[in-house]
Amino acid sequence: KEEQISFRDCAEVFKSGHTTNGVYTLTLPNSTEEVKAYCDMEAGGGGWTIIQRREDGSVDFQRTWKEYKVGFGNPSGEYWLGNEFVSQLTNQQRYVLKIHLKDWEGNEAYSLYEHFYLSSEELNYRIHLKGLTGTAGKISSISQPGNDFSTKDADNDKCICKCSQMLTGGWWFDACGPSNLNGMYYPQRQNTNKFNGIKWYYWKGSGYSLKGTTMMIRPADF
């Protein structure tokens, strides 16, 4: 009888000899639940599990708590992998988070956090980050200490407003904070002075809505 091989993340996929970019099926240890994720096997040594991607505005990111929990979109294009999977994964071992950004002028930048994990759903998938380096700002555009996750139907922010409804998209909103990579996608020449765009303040400043974003994770000991 052939043994069923399963991978918890793209680092395991890479180490098994699959070194081509693409969509792979991942399964958490002691679980039968599968998720489809895009694996970047080229950037910075490969083995990156993509947990978020924006590139063309083809997917609506103004989704419910449940949708952000389980994930949505197309792993080959725009998608959100799912808070529950990422929370379980990042609590089993230490992960780094790399956020890659593109503007409309052809520039690219990144923020790398040396330790990243999400709390459980009971704790609203609060984000925890440590050790920022990279070219997308010396200050973290994800508010520190980390905030709870909010969606249009789950208001967990620190604002008298409802950030997810005001800015659109689910995110770790503060009140509302210097970033929202799940905001409205605006095309070129319509991407400035936006109150609800794809924002990473400490790289592009206020009101600038980005062309592309990718959030990716990998074990710290890869």
């Epitope: 008298i160 407003c161 009140a175 509302c176 303040y201 009101g207």
Partner: nanobody
């Protein structure tokens, strides 16, 4: 489309006055707070004054209190900054910016710089001694 256009800058002698205007379009002042900021050469952008029409609140930086007055005209969708007793250290490019009025942290009155998502191009104020 959201737009903010500043005007009224210029060259003035120390002790003189200027009135800056910020004409807003694409939104109404009722739902937003408008801030005036300034940036001198080689220095960081700093907040000068903010007005929130929804509750009539105004804020002033300590360095301009008693000299500058912020006001708004809802019919013209314009915010003004009356600057009196100008000093050489007031020389800077002055910008107006907008933030949704409700984007406030619980228990706080005003907004961090990164919450202002719409900005004008700025108007230069030069105060000579």
């Amino acid at each position: 489309e959201v737009q903010l256009v500043e005007s009224g800058g210029g060259l003035v002698q120390a002790g003189g006055s200027l009135r800056l205007s910020c004409a807003a379009s694409g939104f109404t002042l009722d739902d937003y707070a408008i801030g005036w900021f300034r940036q001198a050469p080689g220095k960081e952008r700093e907040g000068v004054s903010t007005i929130r029409d929804s509750d009539g609140s105004t804020y002033y930086a300590d360095s301009v209190k008693g000299r500058f007055t912020i006001s708004s005209d809802n019919d013209k969708n314009t915010v003004y900054l009356q600057m009196n007793s100008l000093k050489p250290e007031d020389t800077a490019v002055y910008y107006c910016a907008a933030v949704p009025a409700g984007r406030l942290r619980f228990g706080e009155q005003w907004y961090p710089l990164y919450e202002y998502d719409a900005w004008g191009q700025g108007t230069l104020v030069t105060v000579s001694s």
